[in-house]
Interface confidence: low
């Protein structure tokens, strides 16, 4: 079927459309082109013989129409007037005519809109404006943006006048924005300038900064305010109700108690002829004195005296802070506040009560803090220490003590040997000892200030010859793969070898076995039951030697998987069942049965005589040993035979 | 028709107490071991530990011995089991179950108590 | 504790089909292997008792076998309702203990 396809459809003022055939007929004699929807020779456009390829002119051609051999027709430099219908008339050689019609619309170019408004300066919550988008133009769509977005739903806000017309009804200030409209049609799309729209609004109520409302006497006054207006506002300054400049910030030096007072802020806008004003009072203190500790007692004794310390001066309605050791004060039954905080009383003082201790005085403004106090609080002596630790020593040797007791003041230190003063010094020594300086040695620590005396006595053994030792244990019963046992030779003596048997063997190389302590220490980690042996110290010198007596190391091991005898599986009816249950376990392990998951006896040896089929069924041994905690079991299924079977025996 | 039915649900926060309960029908209640087992979200299932009901002996878990006491009630036919000391990982599905073939077979179980620990 | 080791630990498959699940045990348990089924309700049963025992009322799809420290549940032809999750447990030794479970899922 022959078609008419117009390329544009929409066609711009100025432009070009191309009236494009389709399906156009074989054996052709010509054709002609009519403006309209009908073949009517008066508007007749063009007509063409395909024999001559002769284009002959109608009464409806502009001069701007150009006809293809294909039939198609161009029409250039379109007008307004040439939107419409056209109809193509074909006429085939056999004279049969066929006809088609197109169409096309033609639009004008749209020029740049502008935006009027009808008040350019709207107050807020007062005004509404009205912008409508300029020129006026038939057939084109209007469209609104706002901050390049398309407008909010609001319902202040308001389209008119086929959308040309944008109204803001109860203007605010988030209004203030960047309006801008679109004019659209078929063939072209323009987009205004950006008109802002200035919202006159304010003043808010000022805000005066800083916020505190605090000063001591001396300081520097600066305030500042400012209140969100349009345009911006003016200020004035009112203090106590007097005027004082028109500035947005006022500056007082060197302030007194008497510029105490209500500060006012008042903020004006012209254009919206509004006045807004904040008060804040303003409060001058005098500096207040710097706080400072007395205490009723200076040289405490430990666990005997109080000591009160007072925070001074007193002032009234103040509130006094305390500090220890740069903390507050910790929660403690020895520490005690007066009901007002001034004195904090440290009853029965340890030496760990030295502090530094402050108190502080809070004002309005900060917190005033006095100097550190340092408690000298007298203790000891404690008893004193002796070193070195030594208890035998060869003859011909020096013989060097240390005594030391923490003690404040430091103790003062006496030597007795076997009960004799020998000197008041904190070190004895004594060259080239002999068997005669054998004896009890006694450190006496003396405090002066608080009259306590402590002693410690060590004796002194001086022989070519050593003793025999002896080996002390740190655990008697250890238990197996959990804990370790360390082995200690007594006594310590000087310049002495240490040595160690196991079943009278030396040292076995192990990952487990540890030396320390000069060899005097032999530590076994994780026990094993083999680890049960007899174990001997030894201690020699250049002179002598000798051997402890073993000491056996009992371990607490098991109870193992135990094993059911005898290995039996299947028995005749009538046969006594007698089960022995053996578990390796150090103690003895305890015993007991299950037939069936139903307890039995607590015995090693489950009897039961003349079986049946009923006995049929899973025979559980139970083992538990106290001492380690531990618990272990074994099953066995036992199958009973109807006597006249003979079934074969299974283990 | 043996039944195991046990108590609801529980919330309880760390460091509390929690007793669920296990009451037992269908069967000579005295004459069968009941067990105790718990199932973490996700997770397997963990022996807790058993209690014959005729003279009230027990065995635990190890590791729930400090955690867990399980008692019986043989006038209502009831098992209960005591955790304390309750922490987050605690939480879990406790679930009761007969033993009823020796050798701890687990022939009927009860359908399960769901116990959230959390602050 | 007697470790056990379950594999695999989850499985997809189709009705009709056979499927076999282990359990390797860390030490012999004689036979005291244990077979149990749970639904995602939570509901728990048990299966196969002391190996090969076939709880009465179980289905004959469903089968135990093994010794010594290495066990098998086997379902000769996997029904709808068999879609759930296996356990298999000891009981030789104290404590009772559980292998980790085999999800069977639907293909």
């Known amino acids: 079927k022959l078609t008419i396809e117009s390329t544009p459809f929409n066609v711009a003022e100025g432009k070009e459309v191309l009236l494009l055939v389709h399906n156009l007929p074989q054996h052709l004699f010509g054709y002609s082109w009519y403006k309209g929807e009908r073949v009517d020779g008066n508007r007749q456009i063009i007509g063409y013989v395909i024999g001559t390829q002769q284009a002959t002119p109608g009464p409806a051609y502009s001069g701007r129409e150009i006809i293809y051999p294909n039939a198609s027709l161009l029409i250039q430099n379109i007008i307004q007037n040439d939107t419409g219908f056209y109809t193509l008339h074909v006429i085939k050689s056999d004279l049969v005519n066929e006809e088609a019609t197109g169409q096309f619309r033609v639009y004008p170019e749209l020029p740049k809109p502008s935006i009027s408004s009808n008040n350019s300066k709207p107050v807020e919550d007062k005004d509404a404006v009205a912008f409508t988008c300029e020129p006026e133009t038939q057939d084109a769509t209007y469209l609104w943006w706002v901050n390049n977005q398309s407008l909010p739903v609001s319902p202040r806000l308001q389209l008119s006048n086929g959308n040309r017309t944008l109204t803001l009804f109860n203007v605010t200030r988030n209004d203030t924005a960047s309006y801008k409209c679109e004019t659209q049609n078929p063939v072209s799309a323009r987009r205004s300038d950006s008109v802002i729209l200035n919202v006159l609004y304010g003043p808010d109520a000022p805000t005066i900064s800083p916020l505190n409302t605090s000063y001591r006497s001396g300081e520097n006054l600066n305030l500042s305010c400012h209140a969100a207006s349009n345009p911006p506002a003016q200020y004035s300054w009112f203090v106590n109700g007097t005027f004082q400049q028109s500035t947005q910030e006022l500056f007082i030096p060197n302030i007194t108690v008497n510029n105490s007072g209500s500060y006012t802020c008042q903020a004006h806008n012209s254009d919206t002829g509004l006045n807004r004003t904040t008060v804040t009072t303003i409060t001058v203190y005098a500096e207040p004195p710097k706080p400072f500790i007395t205490s009723n007692n200076s040289n405490p004794v430990e666990d005997e005296d109080a000591v009160a310390l007072t925070c001074e001066p007193e002032i009234q309605n103040t509130t006094y802070l305390w500090w220890v050791n740069n903390q507050s004060l910790p929660v403690s039954p020895r520490l005690q506040l007066s009901n007002d905080n001034r004195t904090l009383t440290l009853l029965s003082v340890t030496r760990n009560d030295v502090g530094p201790y402050e108190c502080g005085i809070q004002n309005e403004l900060s917190v005033d803090h006095s100097d550190p106090v340092i408690l000298n609080v007298l203790y000891g002596p404690d008893d004193p220490t002796i070193s070195p630790s030594y208890t035998y020593y060869r003859p011909g040797v020096n013989l060097s003590l240390s005594c030391h007791a923490a003690s404040n003041p430091p103790a003062q230190y006496s030597w007795l040997i076997d009960g004799n003063i020998q000197q008041h010094t904190q070190e004895l020594f004594i060259s080239n000892i002999t068997e005669k300086n054998s004896g009890l040695y006694t450190c006496q620590a003396n405090n002066s200030a608080s009259g306590h005396s402590r002693t410690t006595v060590k004796t002194i053994t001086v022989s070519a010859e050593l003793p025999k030792p002896s080996i002390s244990s740190n655990n008697s019963k250890p238990v197996e793969d959990k804990d370790a046992v360390a082995f200690t030779c007594e006594p310590e003596a000087q310049n002495t070898t240490y040595l160690w048997w196991v079943n009278g063997q030396s040292l076995p190389v192990s990952p487990r076995l540890q030396l320390s302590n000069g060899n005097r220490t032999l530590t076994l980690f994780n026990v094993t039951r083999n680890d049960a042996r007899a174990y001997v110290c030894g201690i020699q010198n250049s002179v002598s030697a000798n051997r402890s007596d073993p000491v056996t190391l009992d371990v607490l091991y098991g109870p193992d998987t135990p094993i059911i005898s005898p290995p039996d599986s299947s028995y005749l009816s009538g046969a006594n069942l007698n089960l022995s249950c053996h578990s390796a376990s150090n103690p003895s392990p305890q015993y007991s049965w299950r037939i069936n998951g139903i307890p039995q006896q607590h015995t090693q040896v489950l009897f039961i005589a003349k079986i049946t089929p009923n006995n049929n069924g899973t025979y559980a041994c139970f083992v538990s040993n106290l001492a380690t905690g531990r618990n272990n079991s074994i099953v066995k299924s036992i199958t009973v035979s109807a006597s006249g079977t003979s079934p074969g025996l299974s283990a | 028709e043996v039944q195991l039915v046990q108590s609801g649900a529980e919330v309880k926060k760390p460091g509390a107490s929690v007793k669920v309960s296990c009451k037992a029908s269908?069967?000579?209640?005295?004459?069968?071991?009941m067990n105790w087992v718990r199932q973490a979200p996700g997770q397997g299932l963990e022996w807790i530990g058993d209690i014959f009901p005729k003279n009230g002996n027990t065995d635990y878990n190890r590791k729930f011995k400090d955690k867990a006491t399980l008692t019986v009630d043989k006038s209502t036919s009831t098992v209960y089991m005591e955790f304390r000391s309750l922490r987050s990982e605690d939480t879990a599905v406790y679930y009761c179950?007969?033993?009823?073939?020796?050798?701890?077979?687990?022939?009927?179980w009860g359908q399960g108590t769901l116990v959230t620990v959390s602050s | 504790d007697v470790q056990m080791t379950q594999s695999p630990s989850s499985l997809s498959a189709s009705v009709g089909d056979r499927v076999t699940i282990t359990c390797r045990t860390s030490q012999d348990i004689n036979i005291y292997l244990n077979w149990y089924q749970q639904k995602p309700g939570g509901a728990v049963k048990l299966l196969i008792y002391y190996r090969s025992g076939l709880l009465s009322g179980v289905p004959s799809r469903f089968s135990g076998s093994g010794s010594g420290t290495d066990y098998t549940l086997t379902i000769s032809s996997l029904q709808p309702e068999d879609f759930a999750t296996y356990y298999c447990?000891?009981?030789?030794?104290?404590?009772?203990?559980f292998g980790g479970g085999t999800k069977v899922e639907i293909k």
């Open positions: 179950a007969r033993s009823g073939y020796g050798n701890y077979v687990f022939d009927y």
């Open positions: 269908g069967y000579t209640f005295t004459d069968f071991y």
């Open positions: 447990q000891q009981g030789n030794t104290l404590p009772p203990t």
